[in-house]
């Protein structure tokens, strides 16, 4: 039974692991960026730090047809407790303020690295 334990289905991914994987994905995007990310698409900026994962997803989910950020969108959905669909507008967004997807991803990476260092995995 001890040996067979290794074949058991894995439990949920620890939050620290999920955050680290999201950071690694964002690093990949920023480092491998050659042409303008998502053809220079613009997304809503964010003006607060609370509820950030859902707000980030609400911004990025409005970018369609950009394979480079599809994995990021999926990963962010794992951090957001509610269903997010295109067109949603959170109070966390700066209304009438849009920034380039590339800058959004770069800033998201900065913020998540800070959270990781501070041990804030959720």
């Amino acid at each position: 039974l001890t040996c067979l334990g290794g074949f058991a289905s894995p439990g949920p991914v620890p939050p620290s692991t999920a955050l680290r994987e999201l950071i690694e994905e964002l690093v990949n995007i920023t480092q491998n960026q050659k042409a303008p990310l998502c053809n220079g698409s613009m997304v809503w900026s964010i003006n607060l730090t609370a509820g950030m994962y859902c707000a980030a997803l609400e911004s990025l989910i409005n970018v369609s047809g950009c394979s480079a950020i599809e994995k990021t969108q999926r990963m962010l959905s794992g951090f957001c407790p509610h269903k997010v669909s295109a067109g949603q507008f959170s109070s966390l967004h700066v209304r009438d303020t849009k920034i380039e997807v590339a800058q959004f991803v770069k800033d998201l990476l900065l913020h998540l690295k800070k959270l990781f260092r501070e041990g804030q995995f959720n």
Partner: nanobody
Framework: GVQLLESGGGLVQPGGSLRLSCAAS????????MGWVRQAPGKGLEWVSA????????YYADSVKGRFTISRDNSKNTLYLQMNSLRAEDTAVYYC???????????WGQGTLVTVSS
């Protein structure tokens, strides 16, 4: 792209006050530590003050401690520097800048001139 636009500089008498503002755009201001740096005529850059992204922690150079107050409004994407009890030695161009250790996150404004003179 990223823009930092300072305003509020000008001529003020010794002992007077000024409030500098820095309007940020093109990046997620709320997630950045920010600061003010100044350059007096013919001198090098001098760090003045910094504030953490959430606004809880503030830092000051000894030369301005007790006289200057840094603050931010993340809902308005704006950084402030309230300068009281101004002295002639505070005369400088004041720059708003991001204050991040990470390479590639270094953004600066064009600066605003503060002249303290009678």
């Amino acid at each position: 792209g990223v823009q930092l636009l300072e305003s509020g500089g000008g001529l003020v008498q010794p002992g007077g006050s000024l409030r500098l503002s820095c309007a940020a755009s093109g990046f997620i201001f709320a997630w950045y530590d920010m600061g003010w740096v100044r350059q007096a005529p013919g001198k090098g850059l001098e760090w003045v003050s910094a504030i953490a992204a959430k606004g809880m922690e503030t830092y000051y150079a000894d030369s301005v401690k007790g006289r200057f107050t840094i603050s931010r409004d993340n809902s308005k994407n704006t950084l402030y520097l309230q300068m009281n009890s101004l002295r002639a030695e505070d005369t400088a161009v004041y720059y708003c800048a991001t204050a991040e250790d990470e390479p590639g996150y270094d953004y600066w404004g064009q600066g605003t001139l503060v002249t303290v003179s009678s």
